[in-house]
Amino acid sequence: QSSERRVVAHMPGDIIIGALFSVHHQPTVDKVHERKCGAVREQYGIQRVEAMLHTLERINSDPTLLPNITLGCEIRDSCWHSAVALEQSIEFIRDSLISSEEEEGLVRCVDGSSSSFRSKKPIVGVIGPGSSSVAIQVQNLLQLFNIPQIAYSATSMDLSDKTLFKYFMRVVPSDAQQARAMVDIVKRYNWTYVSAVHTEGNYGESGMEAFKDMSAKEGICIAHSYKIYSNAGEQSFDKLLKKLTSHLPKARVVACFCEGMTVRGLLMAMRRLGLAGEFLLLGSDGWADRYDVTDGYQREAVGGITIKLQSPDVKWFDDYYLKLRPETNHRNPWFQEFWQHRFQCRLEGFPQENSKYNKTCDSSLTLKTHHVQDSKMGFVINAIYSMAYGLHNMQMSLCPGYAGLCDAMKPIDGRKLLESLMKTNFTGVSGDMILFDENGDSPGRYEIMNFKEMGKDYFDYINVGSWDNGELKMDDDEVWSKKSNIIRSVCSEPCEKGQIKVIRKGEVSCCWTCTPCKENEYVFDEYTCKACQLGSWPTDDLTGCDLIPVQYLRWGDPEPDYKDDDDK
């Protein structure tokens, strides 16, 4: 067992909120059984930890929100992996169980005397985790103990099912909406034949299922569908890329309902195999506008069109985060490890099992260098605020006219908290309304991003459109410098006049060969030639038949030419 996972970030308070963030990358295939996590993460990890700590500080200093009640937290590392997250969730539950037994006077010392030991406060709710697959596993456990869970990026459609996931809510929309947005983009550019890739796991599987269902209804064909784990080895990604090339040049568009690290795996394989520019990747919000996906592989990613949940940067978070330093930031137990990883240097006096870095960290180092805010920061903060407003409304209802925690809130009843959370609505960090429908989901608003080469060796994401409640808006001129540049992704070209489509046995409806109708036939529909009736002949445009005018011979007409059989 890796010691890094035993690390927990604590902040004291009257009410404790749990949180699961992917502070480290998921274990690689060979380390899964040990549950040994990967490298430390900045956007998805450290920034989210700091967001939780600082957001709680802001809530606690807000006199109008939970007055006389201090919110605290216990943050654990999910490593973007179900087994690790479950292990950490059990720790949350264990704390809650011990606390509730204590409330009921069930905690006794071995000699039978009463215990004076105070255990940790119970967790009233959990923020996160990021991954849908992991969130499902965590929810399966939390709901047994009536602990509400608010997710900030788990978008799987399955999580909308309240019969299965009663205590789950989210400040993001269900993936059914971005699947629709992706299909709308495919339709817009008349791509009728695309390859499909998804990340193995709930997010990718359910998202791709929705994409395929919607595509079929729109007459879009899937050349082939492939799945892969984000932590699959190079060989697996190479094989997948080779399979995708077998559908070129017809299926140039690859719809990827993928986690960011799956996309990165594809880009790396494109580099190894010499396939930059051969595909246009259409990516879901797992990719969005993340630089950790494209770093070092920008050439391979150029042209990519991605879906991003609408969430502007949070200025006040940057103001706080960019001032953090390892010598003063002790409440985040992962911060020193992150600092060393970020700047590839060694901190003086920091215990290092294996001193990976030779140079000592310079005191002038600052997080301002190459800073990129986590694209889902707004959602993380909104999830924390949702919990606070839910608790606030619950306190107002259970403790009228009382500032602080009244007896009716000791211990906090998860069922009542869930009820209160579902009714919560407030203005979010970006000025938008945060509310939950009957499934605990939030409304869907997306930005459409395009990864472009902006100048020599300078690449960036630019906003090229939006999808809001079913309406797609795209700036086509920004995506394609001229109409002729629009990539084609079709199996067969339209047939010429007087030809019909013949779909080969076992082929999808988008793949056909064009066959001309016979001399006496017209095009009945796009798949059928029909012979004109006796006495009629196909029209010039071959869309029907005209009667052949009858010409009668009269006396005086020249005799028709004929040849005798005997004539040689």
């Epitope: 190079e234 080779k242 090339t245 040049p249 190894r272 195999l273 010499g274 051969e278």
Partner: antibody, heavy 116, light 110 residues
Framework: QSVEESGGRLVTPGTPLTLTCTVS????????MGWVRHVPGKGLEWIGI?????STYYASWAKGRFTISKTSTTVDLKITSPTTEDTATYFC?????????????WGPGTLVTVSS | AYDMTQTPASVSEPVGGTVTIKCQAS??????LSWYQQKPGQPPKLLIY???TLASGVSSRFKGSGSGTEYTLTISDLECDDAAAYYC????????????FGGGTEVVVK
């Protein structure tokens, strides 16, 4: 479906030479085309490949010395400044797919002799 | 780069015998390997692709196997017409064309 090389001849060192591969029975917009050479007494060596999309890749030793381009029915290999080491039989071959892959069919080859 | 090393450089076997040619890649090529036969004065001919798939019109006496970095071509029931040079080729990466072909194996049929 066939491919055939032409343009091989005796040239003096430094005189640019263009070999042409003419294809029939398939479209160059659907298949990648490669150039391979066989130096007498040695094995086969890849020079470069042009994908259906038009992207080109070369062996590191061939970069700058060779250029591959195509029209709708032909693929050209330009030897920019031949040296005596470039004496070989040059083959043009079609990839099984739109990018790099196993190659089939092959042309009969065209002989290039570089000599002063 | 995916460097291909072929052994042996030459082999001699009687008619009816069996020849085994090995090809090793410097790193995994995920079974993207093809085998070619070349007779003097002729272009190479594709025998096998994707490590074990027989090209059309090729005799089933030719068998390809292997995965990862190790691959084998086996020619059984040798015929006089099998006398030729045989080459393996990595079919995985077009951006690494150096040494994509093995050095070749000369097969002599006695």
């Amino acid at each position: 479906q066939s491919v055939e090389e032409s343009g091989g001849r005796l040239v003096t060192p430094g005189t640019p030479l263009t070999l042409t591969c003419t294809v029939s029975g398939f479209s160059l917009s659907r298949y990648a085309m490669g150039w391979v050479r066989h130096v007498p007494g040695k094995g086969l060596e890849w020079i470069g490949i042009i994908y259906a999309s038009g992207s080109t890749y070369y062996a590191s030793w061939a970069k700058g010395r060779f250029t591959i381009s195509k029209t709708s029915t032909t693929v050209d290999l330009k030897i920019t400044s031949p040296t005596t080491e470039d004496t070989a039989t040059y083959f043009c071959a079609r990839s099984r797919t739109a990018t790099y892959d196993a190659v089939d069919p092959w042309g009969p080859g065209t002989l290039v002799t570089v000599s002063s | 780069a995916y460097d291909m090393t072929q052994t042996p450089a030459s082999v001699s076997e009687p008619v009816g015998g069996t020849v085994t040619i090995k090809c090793q890649a410097s790193q995994s090529i995920s079974s993207y390997l093809s085998w070619y036969q070349q007779k003097p004065g002729q272009p190479p001919k594709l025998l096998i692709y994707e490590a074990s798939t027989l090209a059309s019109g090729v005799s089933s006496r030719f068998k390809g196997s292997g995965s990862g970095t190790e691959y084998t071509l086996t020619i059984s029931d040798l015929e006089c017409d099998d006398a030729a040079a045989y080459y393996c080729q990595q079919d995985l990466s077009g951006s690494n064309l150096d040494n994509s072909f093995g050095g070749g194996t000369e097969v002599v049929v006695k």
